[in-house]
């Protein structure tokens, strides 16, 4: 997931010469964005999210507001300030007329601007209620660890706190931020305002059809009784549970955030602070049968967002739309006809569908695992949750075509047992943005903060692009994809995995002038290889086929063109091993795969040779996929011949250690 | 600590009401609903009904359905249960109890319905 | 709504353990997690001993334990006190309300 890329608007209103009577000029060059929802109908002008520069402090962002009031007034302009935010985003929520933004743009400390939007609740039907009794035998479902140490942070409309199902289990806390409800004769029925978090909370804790039954939650109001509600009452909520983490610190918390929007920076930006700040939130991929990377909180990568499948493990159609998709999502779960407490009555039970019921199964999931586990980072719980789901299950029929490969096939599942995954090497594939057409047009895909890259492939539909290469940004490492002429743009795929204590690095070979083609390995003592890249600048690479196999005793050696540069990623780490495990095929073929056996684990996936007919490499799950072009357009000259190279490895110093604690 | 304090003994007379209160404290009161459970002269318990401290729904049991009022009173974090005509059966002690877990009780009220 | 079922009385020495059973239907017992279960000393109100079938609450003794097997829940006292001599009380969800077992009177010889 990147938060960079949002199909949203973006106005850059540059700064005018003059200063406008201002004390403190902004830095130079720099330019205060403005930016608003993509979805016309969702935006809220008028209402401002002022964001200030990270180290800004309360009393400047305070100052700040002033200055924009009093400037607002000399113009003659009303404004009035919301909210000062602090705690996690520096800046202000403002309600004034857009003639202002100008003027608020070129204010000190001010990083950019954005204008509120609405917020839903992602369950349907969110009216056509059916009284329902609970399906199952209840006894057929009895976890080890019920979640007893996490608290869950319900971000949602009003819930009946006394309902049967979660009598006990919920503190409604004071927040409340919502907007008016829509329309002249809406009439506020309580049972239908607590609809949507009745049943959410009960889907998480609920004594009878909950997932995680022993966890304590909290719910704060932040969507009305039509389940509509704003970025910037979401924004407050978020800061309103980081004050109170901060005010009383307990075990690990979860926030789960069963809404969407329009893609919104702040919003990201605010998901992405409370992350950083130890806290799992858990939200909804958005029931817009779209891509999940253009709503928000989906698309903050920190968050792990959720879409929903059904019964027979297929992508949830919710009327004439569904369950949104592609690379921002990290795994679907349960949410069609799910069974939870309806606000109709104390004792009454309820089937409501959408992402929101499937973002709260992997919340009451992610409770168990955190109260079995209170140590686990959101690094580790997102490879857990990615290990443990049910893999390619899901029909990607389903989806549109440009979306399939994006798109990771795996349900949520329980731990089989809640302890003793410690051992494993974990790793996950991360999908750039798509790079866009033109010439020059890179994709950046990017690890969390405590993964490690480990490899670094690229794949292009078009089959036109330069290859792909490990680089350093920001002091941590990052994986590039490069376009070529004519081509249709490439993405970057990274293969971020969880290895304590590593020490990695990147050895580099140019293209070699030999028509061996060009080799790199890892020469440090105690470095493995774990995934191979290469970059090439030339547009075709023709077709100059290297030796595939490695001379014996060079397992730590990368192979490739000889126009290209190879890229070796060599990492040492306490009790790592990894091995080079490929599959050739002679003939022309659209797909070829290699799978680390049981107990390996894939940290590398690239094709040789790499000549142009080779579309890509990419990870899934445990199996490195090389694709090619058609078969029909390749003809069967030995061209055609595809090896897909698999890099597997283990971790015995994680095996040890697990073995210890047991 | 979380509390229940219920009213005084009350004598009857047959085809009389009786309002029973019962004062919470120690908690977030409107976080849960009150049980009303009772017990007759060496029988055992009998749930009678539940009231919502949320937003004053009910739910009582069919046997009681019509002759039974359950309320609450957030202000004074106090829930209330009136039983109409009353019956010489209907002498027991009369209990409420934290909501439908029924983890914490008052000390009970003794409803004598004499002639 | 019919009472669950449960023996009207039992009896154990000191030190030992005894099992109260409460049996109940596909529509309460089995149907739900919620199965308490209530000690109440002759004068006194209930005291909720287990709840969730096989949940103590805090400052209760871990002599107590519950557990359920289909339709049936069972309350198990071990190393019999003095004290625990009582009545014992099941309860259970139904679809709309609670049912309580009709009590079981525990005598410690």
């Known amino acids: 997931q990147e938060d960079e890329d949002g199909d949203y608007e973006e106005l850059v209103l540059a700064l005018r010469s003059e200063e406008d009577g201002l004390a403190e000029a902004p830095e130079h060059g720099t330019t205060a964005t403005f930016h608003r929802c993509a979805k016309d109908p969702w935006r809220l002008p008028g209402t401002y999210v002022v964001v200030l520069k990270e180290e800004t402090h309360l009393s400047q962002s305070e100052r700040t507001a002033r200055r924009l009031q009093a400037q607002a007034a000399r113009r003659g302009y009303l404004t009035k300030i919301l909210h000062v935010f602090h705690g996690l985003l520096p800046g202000f929520l403002v309600k004034m007329s857009g003639d202002l933004l100008e003027l608020a743009l070129k204010l000190p400390h001010v990083d950019y601007i954005e204008e509120d939007s609405s917020v839903f609740a992602q369950s349907i039907p969110w009216n056509l209620e059916r009284i329902t009794p609970p399906r199952y035998r209840a006894d057929e479902y009895q976890p080890p660890d019920g979640g007893s140490l996490v608290e869950v942070y319900l971000l949602d409309t009003s819930i009946q706190s006394d309902h049967r199902e979660i009598e006990g289990r919920v503190m409604v806390t004071d927040f409340e931020n919502v907007p008016e409800e829509d329309g002249t004769r809406f009439h506020r029925q309580a049972s239908k305002c607590d609809s949507h978090g009745t049943h959410l909370a009960g889907v998480v804790s609920g004594r009878d059809a909950g997932v995680a039954k022993g966890a304590s939650m909290r719910s704060l109001r932040v969507l009305n009784c039509q389940g509509k509600g704003t970025v910037s009452g979401t924004l407050i909520g978020l800061e309103f549970i980081r004050k109170s983490q901060l005010v009383q610190p307990v075990g690990p918390l979860v926030v789960l955030l069963p809404l969407a929007g329009g893609y919104s920076r702040v919003l990201n930006a605010a998901c992405q602070r409370l992350a950083r700040a130890g806290v799992v939130l858990v939200t909804a991929a958005g029931n817009f049968r779209d891509d999940a990377c253009l709503y928000s909180p989906a698309s903050a990568p920190e968050v792990i967002t959720v879409g929903a499948t059904n019964a027979q493990d297929q992508p949830v159609t919710l009327g004439t739309l569904g369950t949104n998709f592609g690379r921002c999502v990290d795994l679907f779960a349960p949410g069609e006809d799910i069974i939870g407490a309806s606000s109709d009555c104390s004792t009454c039970f309820v089937s409501q569908s959408g992402t929101s019921q499937a973002a709260a199964h992997v919340a009451g999931i992610a409770a168990m695992m955190l109260s079995a586990e209170p140590e686990l980072t959101l690094a580790e719980l997102r490879q857990r949750l990615i290990h443990f789901s049910a893999k390619d299950v899901i029909n990607e029929a389903w989806f549109p075509e440009d979306q399939r490969v994006l798109t990771p096939n795996l349900v949520a599942a329980l731990p089989p047992s809640t302890h003793g995954a410690g051992w494993q090497l974990f790793c996950r594939t991360v999908w750039s943005a798509h790079s866009g057409p033109t010439r020059m047009a890179t994709a950046v895909a990017r690890c969390a903060p405590d993964e490690e890259l480990l490899s670094c492939s690229s794949f292009s539909r078009s089959g036109k692009r330069r290859g792909e290469r490990m680089e350093a940004q920001g002091g941590k490492l990052v994986c590039r994809a490069h376009n070529a002429f004519g081509g249709e743009g490439v993405y970057a795929i990274a293969r971020c995995c969880l290895l304590p204590q590593a020490n990695c690095s990147v050895h580099t070979a140019p293209p070699a002038e030999a028509s061996m083609g060009t080799r790199v390995h890892c020469h440090q003592q105690g470095h493995v290889l774990t995934g191979c890249s290469s970059h090439w600048e030339v547009e075709d690479l023709g077709t100059h086929k290297p030796p595939v196999l490695r001379p014996r005793g060079q397992p730590n050696q990368c192979v490739g063109h000889r126009e290209a540069s190879i890229h070796a990623s060599c990492c040492h780490a306490p009790g790592l091993e990894c091995k080079v495990k490929e599959h050739g095929i002679p003939a022309p073929q659209e797909q070829v795969t290699v799978a680390c056996e049981e107990g390996w684990t894939l940290t590398g996936c690239s094709a040789l040779p790499g000549t142009s007919h080779v579309l890509g490499a990419y990870a899934v799950d445990n199996t490195c996929v090389v694709r090619s072009r058609d078969v029909s357009t390749t003809g069967s000259t030995s061209e055609g011949a595809v090896t897909a190279v698999a890099i597997c490895c283990r971790s015995r110093h994680l095996a040890q250690a697990s073995q210890e604690l047991q | 600590q979380v509390q229940l304090v219920q009213s005084g003994a009350e004598v009857k007379k047959p085809g009389a009401s009786v309002k029973v209160s019962c004062k919470a404290s120690g908690y977030s009161f409107t976080s849960y609903g009150i049980s009303w459970v009772r017990q007759a002269p060496g029988q055992g318990l009998e749930w009678m009904g539940w009231v919502s401290a949320y937003n004053g729904n009910t739910n009582y049991a069919q046997k009681f359905q019509g002759r039974v009022t359950m309320t609450t009173d957030t202000s004074t974090s106090t829930a209330y249960m009136e039983l109409r005509s009353l019956r010489s059966d209907d002498t027991a002690v009369y209990y409420c109890a934290r909501g439908y877990v029924m983890d914490v009780w008052g000390q009970g009220t003794t409803v004598t319905v004499s002639s | 709504q019919s009472a669950l079922t449960q023996p009207a009385s039992v009896s154990g020495s000191p030190g030992q353990s005894i099992t109260i059973s409460c049996t109940g239907t596909s529509s309460d017992v089995g149907a739900y997690n919620s199965v308490s279960w209530y000690q109440q000393h002759p004068g006194k109100a209930p005291k909720r001993m287990i709840y969730e079938v096989s949940n103590r609450p805090s400052g209760v003794s871990n002599r107590f334990s519950g557990s359920k097997s289909g339709n049936t829940a069972s309350l198990t006292i071990s190393g019999l006190q003095a004290e625990d001599e009582a009545d014992y009380y099941c309860?259970?969800?139904?679809?709309?309300?609670?049912?309580f077992g009709g009590g079981t009177k525990l005598t410690v010889l």
């Open positions: 309860s259970s969800y139904t679809s709309t309300n609670m049912v």
